[in-house]
Structure formats: C-alpha cells, structure tokens
Interface confidence: low
C-alpha cells in the first residue's frame, strides 16, 4: 500500500463545529488483495517540526481515510498551541497519517507509508459562504500533485470536493470534471467526484500526465468556472531488463603506447528503460563482475560503471531511461615488455529486476597488450651557438612514438666521447617522454677545440632495462662575445625592448634575450615581455628545463606574487597579463603594467603631439588621465 500524495492541505478556522469533515486521504494498492487501514499520528506539529501537543481534535475513519473534527478547536486551545511554537506565529500545523500495518513508532514521516496533512490556521470563524470566491469554493490553496506506481492495480487516488465547504455551505453547487485526451487512463466519477485509474499504468510508455481539473460553481444565477493543473507522475519499478543498444556486446582494444594506470581501454554501453534503482543505490544494486577472476586480470584491469540518465521517445512523449557505460580501465601501469591477448568478460546484473527473463548481461572485451620497443633514429645532428647561455634549449631527442606514450617511463642520458667537451645535458620531459637537450657547461662551449661535440644518446626504460641508442653530433658555431656589463641574470627583468635585446640571460640560445611584442588587447596571453627564447618562454607551461632555475623563465614558473592586471597560471606563472610583464625572480615578484611611452623613446613628432594635447586640454584632463592609469594598475 502507498499514499497517492506525500502531503495534503486544508484550512482550519476557530470554532469550526465538531463533526466537520476535513478531507480524504487515499491509498493505492501494490497487490489486489491489500486493504488499506489509516492511522493518525499522536501529535500535532508546528514550525520547524516542533511537537506542539497531543492531537485531541482531529480523527480519521480507519477504513475510508476521512479526516474530521472530533471537537471544536476553540480560541483558548489555539492560544495554548501557539504558546508552544518557539515564539513563531502559528500559521500552519500538521499531522502525520500512517498506513497500517506499519511500525507503531511515530518517527520520520516518509512516503510511501506516511503522508503529512497540513492545516492552514485562520484565527477567525469560518467565513460567510457568500463571501467565498469561486477559487476558494473549488480547490485547496496548494495545488495537489499525485504519484502512482506503475504496474499496480487501478484504484481511487483523489476526491475533488472541499468537504468543509460542502458541509458548511450546502446551498452552493460545485461540479468537477477532468479535461483529458482520448484513451487516457483516468476517470472522474460524476456522483462521488472520485478520481481513479482505469488500468495499471506503464511508466516506460508515459511518465507524466499534465491533466486539467475544471470546477463549475453555481450560486443562485451565478455560474463561474475555475481551472487548475492536475499533474500525475508515474513512479518507476525495475520491470525492464538491461539490453545492448544496437546489439553491440563486444569491444576490441589494443593496449600499446597508452599504458598508464586509469587509461580507459574500451567502453561498452548498456541500456535500461528503467530509472530505478535511484542514483544512491544504483552502484550497489546494478553490479558488475570482471571475468576471469585470475589475479593478473583482477590486478591489471578494473571495470568502471558510469550510469547516466537519458530520455527516449515513447508514444509521442519523452520518458526517462538509463544508459550504463562500462569502461575497462587499466588498474596499474603496464610494463613495456607485457605481451598477451585475452578475452575478458563483464557480468552485469540488474539485481532488482524481477523478470520475466533475466536481468543479466555478459559484456565481452577482446584485449591485446602489445610490447613496446624503444627505437631512436640512427643519428642526430644539431648546431649550438658559442654565445649560448646555460640552460639554453637546443633540441629534442625522442624515441619512436614517444609523443603517444603515457605510463611508459623513458630516461635519456648523454655519454660524451670527449670528456673536456661535455657541454650538453638532457632531461626527460614528463609531457611527451622526449628528452630536451640543453647547454649545461658554457665554459666547455667556449673552448676552441670543442668545435664538434660527439655524444651517444641512450634512452632507457628502467622497469625492463630496455634501451635504445643513437649518435648525436653537435656543431659549435660563431664567436664568443662577452656579456654587456650590468646585465641581469634573467632576461625577464628587462621591461623595455632596447635593454632586453642588448643583454643575454639564462636559457638564451643566441646569447641575447628576445623581445616578445604583445597584441595590446587588455589582459591577454600574448603580453609583451623579455625572454631567453620566444619558442619556449613564455608558453604558459613551466617545462622541465625551466624548472632547473627560476631565472630562466619566471613568466612560466614563478610561484610568487604578480602585481597588476593579470590572470595567474595553473599552477604557477602568468597565464595572461596586461601590457608588459617583467619579473624579479630573487624577489619572487612579477609586474604587469600598461606599456607607457617614455620620452627617450619618443621622436620629435610624438613629443610635440604630447605637449599640444597637454596644453590644449589643461590640468583637469591630465588628472583624469592619471586616474585612468591608476585604475589600470589596480585591474
């Protein structure tokens, strides 16, 4: 048994006579043989669920669900109740109605076995019948909505009459009907005004019925019509078995370069026309078991269940359904030597499904794990300037397919054939498993005899000790030119183009810093700045070489504070800046400021123009300009 509503509403007035009928509550059956029996909770409740008093006023007919006044609620009783309402004015009280057999303990009131009946209290006597508006004669203030379980026996779930009005105003005639399309499963009896279902409902055919209730009031010669929505929601049960959309029950996958834990190897989709179990219970009741149960499979793979609500069209209306994605996921990083082919299965069980048929499906995954070989080109040839500064990036080495790798660890090493000319270093990039070649020793770079540098590049997967090797020939070009006096260690310090381009800094491949001219479009990723190499800095990413020293590219790597208009990088650096951004790495600070035109940079014409505008516009305009500048600084 279950209530067709979780809440009912009616009005209560002072001194309403004992015996006044208030309203009917309705229960619907889950099985044909069930007989409802109603029981009222012992207490009246007020604001914030405050227990006010034992209920001495309202009774229920156990078999019909009719609530009525057992004794009149007089003013003194009402004041006594109000005094217990935690100081709030008592505008609404409620009772709990239970369906027997249920537990006799009056605890939480949860649908389907309990409903709340709310009474709006008016501290006056019942109004004169002639003063009641048609709306008040027809329907309660709060519009009802109904919930009916699918596949259950038909039954009565509502009674239209407002019983106190009918009882106290017998001369007013009120008639009701339901506006509904042909063939709908509801009926309003013209005599009793009871609304019932004609047959069991099927949620998978239709989930919501937006009906309209029409009330016609006859008072003397007056006839008025009132219409209100009458919504019915069909509640789901697990009566649909899971199926494969388009019959696809098998997925094939190859695990090769993507071998990282949490990699999704393959996905299969299951469709279920039901939306139960509800999300909180779904994973517990919709189970999936990975087969075979051998330890290698169980440790290497897991199945992730991703349910999602969807909507499907049925009989011209949309109803909700569920799609379940089952992802076969790597449970651990796979060694590059791992080489096997297997047939895995996932047993999916909709454990709440009662039939007919089985609520079980078998999903098939054909998985090939291929070994990965490490290969390098036979040789690399690069050139480097004698003027290059320490940490200048001069190239990359990369085993075959390294950009596609994930979960594969490759470490690169350089072995120099000439000990005194060991200029370069290599670090492995976490992003694409490549090795970045950089200048590590500038002294060796300047030695005249170090004109050609010979290295062996060795790429190793330490997990399997597999290796690949390649020759690297580096040609040293150009002449060494000493650094200008007073140049900073970091290119990023320079705020203007001339001072930027006359100095070098850490990470500079040419021995000179490069100016990047921004686009001047407010706070932009393309801000103006001084960089050791605009190829790598700033690019919104603090790479593995730049992490070696904060002076190389603080624009990408600084963890300190940024003053002025900017958007911070994630997790560090400047993502976007206003105007020109320069940095002081030792102080862990960067500044992004408007690109102000300094007089030395102005030509005659520009200076003249500036003077004219200042003289013409006077002091007030100048003040506004400074104010404007100040505003930009803050934003």
């Amino acid at each position: 048994l279950y209530f067709s509503r979780d809440a009912y509403w009616e009005k209560l007035y002072v001194d309403q006579p004992a015996g006044t009928p208030l309203l009917y509550v309705h229960a619907l059956r889950d099985a044909p043989e069930e007989v409802p029996s109603f029981r009222l909770g012992q207490h009246l409740y007020g604001t914030y669920r405050t227990r006010l008093h034992e209920n001495n006023w309202i009774c229920i007919q156990e078999d019909t669900g009719l609530l009525y006044l057992n004794r009149s609620l007089d003013r003194s009783s009402w004041e006594k109740l109000s005094g217990r309402n935690r100081g709030f004015p008592l505008l609404t009280v409620y009772l709990k109605v239970f369906l027997s057999p249920t537990s006799l303990r009056e605890g939480e009131c949860q649908w389907p076995g309990c409903a709340r009946v709310y009474f709006s209290f008016f501290n006056t006597s019942f109004p004169a019948c002639t003063s009641l508006k048609p709306r008040e004669l027809c329907f309660p203030e709060t519009r009802p909505s109904f919930r009916i379980r699918e596949n259950r026996p038909p039954g009565t779930f509502h009674q239209f009459r407002l019983l106190p009005v009918q009882f106290l105003c017998p001369n007013i005639s009120v008639a009701y009907r339901l506006l509904e399309g042909e063939g709908l499963p509801f009926r309003c009896a013209p005599d009793s005004l009871e609304v019932s279902t004609r047959w069991a409902l099927d949620r998978e055919q239709r989930e919501k019925y937006e009906l309209v209730a029409v009330c016609t009031v006859h008072a003397g010669a007056r006839e008025e019509v009132v219409m209100v929505p009458f919504p019915v929601t069909v509640y789901d049960e697990d009566d649909s078995a899971p199926t494969f959309p388009a019959g696809v029950d098998t997925a094939s996958a190859v695990v090769e370069f993507k071998r990282k834990e949490d990699t999704v190897v393959a996905t299969l989709r299951v469709f279920d026309a039901d939306v139960v179990p509800a999300s909180g219970e779904l994973v517990r009741r919709y189970t999936s078991t990975l087969l075979p149960g051998d330890t290698w499979t169980q440790q290497t793979f897991r199945v992730e269940h991703w349910p999602n609500e969807t909507s499907v069209q049925a009989n011209g209306s949309f109803v909700r359904a569920t799609v379940h994605d089952y992802r076969l996921v790597l449970n651990r990083n796979l060694s590059i030597s791992e080489n096997r082919t297997m047939q895995l299965a996932v047993l999916v069980n909709d454990s709440d499904f009662q039939g007919p048929g089985a609520g079980v499906l078998l999903l098939h995954f054909n998985v090939s794990v291929l070994p990965v070989s490490l290969h390098l080109p036979s040789s690399y040839s690069l050139s480097v300037s004698r003027r290059a500064r320490r940490f200048a990036q001069i190239g990359k080495v990369c085993v075959e397919n390294c950009q596609a790798f994930s979960g594969i660890n490759v470490q690169y090493e350089l072995h120099s054939s000439g000990a005194n000319c060991s200029t370069l270093g290599v670090v492995t990039s976490a992003e694409d498993t490549s090795g970045i070649l950089f200048v590590n020793d500038t002294k060796a770079l300047r030695r005249p005899k170090c004109a050609e540098l010979h290295y062996m590049v060795v790429a190793t997967n330490h997990q399997t000790s597999r290796q690949a090797q390649a020759q690297l020939l580096v040609t040293v070009e150009g002449l060494y030119v000493a650094e200008e006096a007073g140049c900073p260690l970091s290119c990023a310090v320079s705020k203007r183009r001339p001072e930027c381009e006359e100095c070098g800094g850490l990470g500079s491949p040419t021995g000179r810093c490069e100016w990047r001219q921004g686009d001047g479009k407010g706070i932009t990723r393309n801000f103006s700045t001084c960089s050791p190499s605009t190829k790598t800095c700033p690019d919104g990413h603090c790479d593995v070489v730049e992490t070696q020293d904060i002076n190389i590219c603080p624009q990408d790597c600084l963890r300190g504070s940024i003053v002025g208009g900017h958007e911070p990088g994630e997790p560090r650096g400047i993502k976007a800046g206003y105007g020109t951004c320069n940095c002081f790495p030792e102080e862990e600070k960067c500044f992004c400021e408007p690109e102000d035109i300094q007089d030395p940079l102005c030509d005659e014409l520009c200076r003249e123009q500036k003077l004219i505008s200042e003289e013409d516009l006077g002091g007030e305009q100048k003040l506004i300009s400074e104010e404007d500048l100040h505003h930009h600084h803050h934003h």
Partner: antibody, heavy 120, light 107 residues
Framework: QVQLVESGGGVVQPGRSLRLSCAAS????????MHWVRQAPGKGLEWVAV????????YFVDSVKGRFTISRDNSKNTLFLQMNSLRVDDTAVYYC?????????????WGQGTLVTVSS | DIQMTQSPSSLSASVGDRVTITCRTS??????LNWYQQKPGKAPKLLIY???RSQSGVPSRFSGSGSGTDFTLTISSLQPEDFATYYC?????????FGGGTKVEIK
C-alpha cells in the same frame, strides 16, 4: 608527513573476535589502496589483505578468507580489519601499509604495528 | 600463488663488505619485485621497487637488479646501520608474497 597508526590489538581466546583500526594522516587517504601485513613472533612477513582506494575491490590470503573482513572509512581516513574465529596461528604483529600508486603493489609506508595474541 | 625463495637465510659480514642477496620466484613476474629492510621491533622500510628503482631517501649503496624470475639486492659497502633483515616481495598478483628473509649480521 605520512603516518599510519594501528590500534585494537590485545590478548584474545581462540574463536573470539577482534577489530583492528589504522588511522592515516599526511596524505589523501581516499587515493591509495591499503593493506594489512602480519608477522608472527620470530617469523617472516605474511600479507593478509588489501582494500582498493575506492573500496570496490578486496583480496585476502587463503588462510583468513571467510574469517577476516577488511573495510575503510574514507571520510575518517581509517582502515579496519575485523578478525573473527581467531586461531592460535593468527598470533602476530599486524601492520597496516599504504600501497604506492606506482607499477605493481608496492608498500611504501608502514605503521608501527599492533600485537594480537590468540591464546587459551 | 607465487612462491618466493630468498637466499641465503642469514649471512655474516663486516663493515665495508659487498653483500648480495638473491630472490627467486616460482613464475615470471617481469619486474614486479620490491625489497624491504626491517630492523628488530620496527616496521619494514621500502628500499627498492620495480626490481631496480630506489625509493627516495635510500642510500645509493643499495641497488637492485634482475627480471623474470631471478632478482638480486646488492649493498656495495656495508655500513653499521645496514645490519637488519631484508625481504623481497612480488607485486605481480595477489596474494602478495614475501621471501623468507635474509638476516645480515655482524661478523
């Protein structure tokens, strides 16, 4: 820093039950698989059980299957081992250990252990 | 279950000696092998994982090698604090299994 503190050990008669707890701190508990390993007096290490990070999977050594259950409360950063039908050969120091998220099942941090003595 | 055979079960050595401990598995486990050190009354401490990779903070005198079924832990120059029991452990499949241990004592 990573810390694992076991508790709940003691002396118990054969056939009785005991519940061990392991309080974790200094790392994001919900991201790591957690294990129980035991060591009988004067003997070597024996792995007992594991609970995966999300609580979805668990495995046991054959000798405790059906008697021991492993659980975790990610909201309280705590791992549990419920030991029922205890036998004399379950006497050991029980360690809780964290599984590092690198290849294979590597136990990178261990608690100080709690002694369980099963004796009549 | 994968069986782990560790040898020797004990050895005596002097400070400065080179010490080698071996571990053999009943089936190939590629490189899913870890080494732990345990001192009396203390919890085990991870030294080497994935057969040859050093856990951070572990002195460089400890190294691991091997793959498949045969693995070795080497202490290049034994120090006073290295006297302890060493265990290998396979992490290829459950149940996880440990070797019987090798006790390194002062000669």
């Amino acid at each position: 820093q990573v810390q694992l503190v076991e508790s709940g050990g003691g002396v118990v008669q054969p056939g009785r039950s005991l519940r061990l707890s392991c309080a974790a701190s200094g790392f994001t508990f919900r991201n790591y698989g957690m294990h129980w390993v035991r060591q009988a007096p004067g003997k070597g290490l024996e792995w007992v059980a594991v609970k995966r990070y999300d609580g979805s999977d668990e495995y046991f050594v054959d000798s405790v299957k059906g008697r021991f259950t492993i659980s975790r409360d990610n909201s309280k950063n705590t791992l549990f081992l419920q030991m029922n039908s205890l036998r004399v050969d379950d006497t050991a120091v029980y360690y809780c250990a964290r599984e590092t998220p690198i290849t294979g099942t590597t136990l990178d941090y261990w608690g100080q252990g709690t002694l369980v003595t099963v004796s009549s | 279950d994968i069986q782990m055979t560790q040898s020797p079960s004990s050895l005596s050595a002097s400070v400065g000696d080179r010490v080698t401990i071996t571990c053999r598995t009943s089936q190939s486990i590629t490189n899913y092998l870890n080494w732990y050190q345990q001192k009396p009354g203390k919890a085990p401490k991870l030294l080497i994982y994935a057969a040859s990779r050093s856990q951070s903070g572990v002195p460089s005198r400890f190294s691991g090698s091997g793959s498949g079924t045969d693995f070795t832990l080497t202490i290049s120059s034994l120090q006073p604090e290295d006297f302890a029991t060493y265990y290998c452990q396979q992490s290829y499949s459950t149940p996880l299994t440990f070797g019987g241990g090798t006790k390194v004592e002062i000669k």
